[in-house]
């Protein structure tokens, strides 16, 4: 149930936005799939986790991710909203103590083991541009979204609001 305005309008605000409370306002477990219904899976290899985008076999169980939602305040001079200019930020954890991180230098999405408080690289601004689809924008790099590239998750720069409907940054959440 998640749309987006021109990215540029709010990009500066992301750097300055503060998460209003250290505990999430809600959490749920969901499986993550691409717009084209490929599953996001996580595999332990050589003591580190790898993230894959793949077609699952018919009865293969989907991996679940814990999504934790945090309220984050736009600076009032950016949004003009005062108290009501709230964004939702999420962290994504497929297994205990591991969170998805944005590696902006490598343009990659990685799983890192870390303790709370989580670093900014683990927070993503939630958008939805289509019914039932969500997108994840890096808190640390506004205008850059988690996307699919060559059957892996990668960071993808979205340079204008016209490109925000590009299918490779759209994801579906489901309970099954």
């Amino acid at each position: 149930a998640f749309g987006i305005s021109g990215v540029q309008k709010y990009t500066r605000a992301l750097h300055d936005s503060s998460i209003t409370g250290i505990s999430p306002i809600t959490e749920y477990l969901a499986s993550l799939s691409t717009y084209n219904d490929q599953s996001i899976t996580f595999a332990l290899e050589d003591e580190s986790y790898e993230i894959y985008v793949e077609d699952l076999k018919k009865d293969e169980k989907k991996d679940k991710v814990l999504l934790s939602y945090y309220e984050s305040q736009h600076p009032s001079n950016e949004s003009g909203d005062g108290v009501d200019g709230k964004m939702l930020m999420v962290t994504l954890s497929p297994t205990k103590d591991f969170w998805l991180h944005a590696n902006n230098k490598e343009h990659s999405v990685e799983l890192h083991k870390c303790e709370k408080p989580l670093p900014d690289q683990a927070f993503f601004v939630l958008h939805n541009m289509h019914s039932n689809c969500v997108s994840f924008e890096c808190k640390t790099d506004p205008g850059v979204f988690i996307g699919v590239k060559d059957n892996h998750l990668a960071l993808i720069k979205v340079d204008s609001s016209e490109n925000l409907c590009t299918e490779n940054i759209l994801f579906k959440l489901s309970e099954t």
Epitope: A1, F2, G3, I4, S5, G6, K9, Y10, I25, T26, Y28, A30, Y69, E71, H74, S79, G80, D81, G82, D84, G85, K86, M87, L88, V125, L126, H127, N128, M129, H130, S131, N132, S161, L164, C165, L173, S174, E175, T176
Partner: antibody, heavy 120, light 110 residues
Framework: EVQLVESGGGLVQPGGSLRLSCAAS????????MIWVRQAPGKGLEWVGV???????YYATWAKGRFTISRDNSKNTLYLQMNSLRAEDTAVYYC??????????????WGQGTLVTVSS | AFQMTQSPSSVSASVGDRVTITCQAS??????VSWYQQKPGKAPKLLIY???KLASGVPSRFSGSGSGTDFTLTISSLQPEDFATYYC????????????FGGGTKVEIK
């Protein structure tokens, strides 16, 4: 102050058209999902449709074809164009705004509503 | 088409009573459900979002629970100002829906 004010309601004959406006103040309308909701006299709330910040629009199944949602960012105003109106479209029409930017979410800000009466 | 089924359609209760209203989604909406209170001649007012999060300024006697397809709004001790109509809404799917709102529950004085 964050506020929504609807206008444009009134009496219209069956088969006629009407355009409702919803003027937003205190926030940028284009950053939020904006929704139209209606309520027939003595009935429940009925979701009409939504315009996303990226201009995607979704309508209730019954509203497709007759109702059109649009917005003018320069005027910070939301619109609902209603065509081929019927007696059963008689209702108070509300515009509403989601609680969060970018995300379709709960409706935290509502207008006062504008009454549309379809009658000959 | 996607639907929200709310029950009961009306309930008679006294001040101090515990009132429970339920809402069922025709398919899973995770926890994307909100609850509204509406009084005659007024616009709806947000009470609960994300199924259980209390909206700003809403008294703690209101609470919400549920996930997936089944959701509940509870008023722990009904106050005179709580006599109103309550609606659930799914905030998940905007595609192919008849109505995002439930049919409403009128809470009346016994």
């Amino acid at each position: 102050e964050v506020q929504l004010v609807e206008s444009g309601g009134g009496l219209v004959q069956p088969g006629g058209s009407l355009r409702l406006s919803c003027a937003a103040s205190g926030f940028s309308l284009s950053s939020y999902h904006m929704i139209w909701v209606r309520q027939a006299p003595g009935k429940g709330l009925e979701w009409v449709g939504v315009i996303y910040p990226n201009s995607n629009i979704y309508y209730a199944t019954w509203a497709k074809g007759r109702f059109t949602i649009s917005r003018d960012n320069s005027k910070n105003t939301l619109y609902l164009q209603m065509n081929s109106l019927r007696a059963e479209d008689t209702a108070v029409y509300y515009c509403a705004r989601t609680i969060y930017v970018h995300v379709y979410s709960a409706l935290s800000i509502w207008g006062q509503g504008t009454l549309v009466t379809v009658s000959s | 088409a996607f639907q929200m089924t709310q029950s009961p359609s009306s309930v008679s209760a006294s001040v101090g009573d515990r009132v429970t209203i339920t809402c069922q989604a025709s398919e899973s909406v995770l926890n994307e459900v909100s609850w509204y209170q509406q009084k005659p001649g007024k616009a709806p007012k947000l009470l609960i979002y994300f199924a259980s999060k209390l909206a700003s300024g809403v008294p703690s006697r209101f609470s919400g629970s549920g996930s997936g397809t089944d959701f509940t709004l509870t008023i722990s001790s009904l106050q005179p100002e709580d006599f109103a109509t309550y609606y659930c809404q799914q905030d998940w799917s905007m595609d192919n829906i008849d109505n995002a709102f439930g049919g409403g529950t009128k809470v009346e004085i016994k």
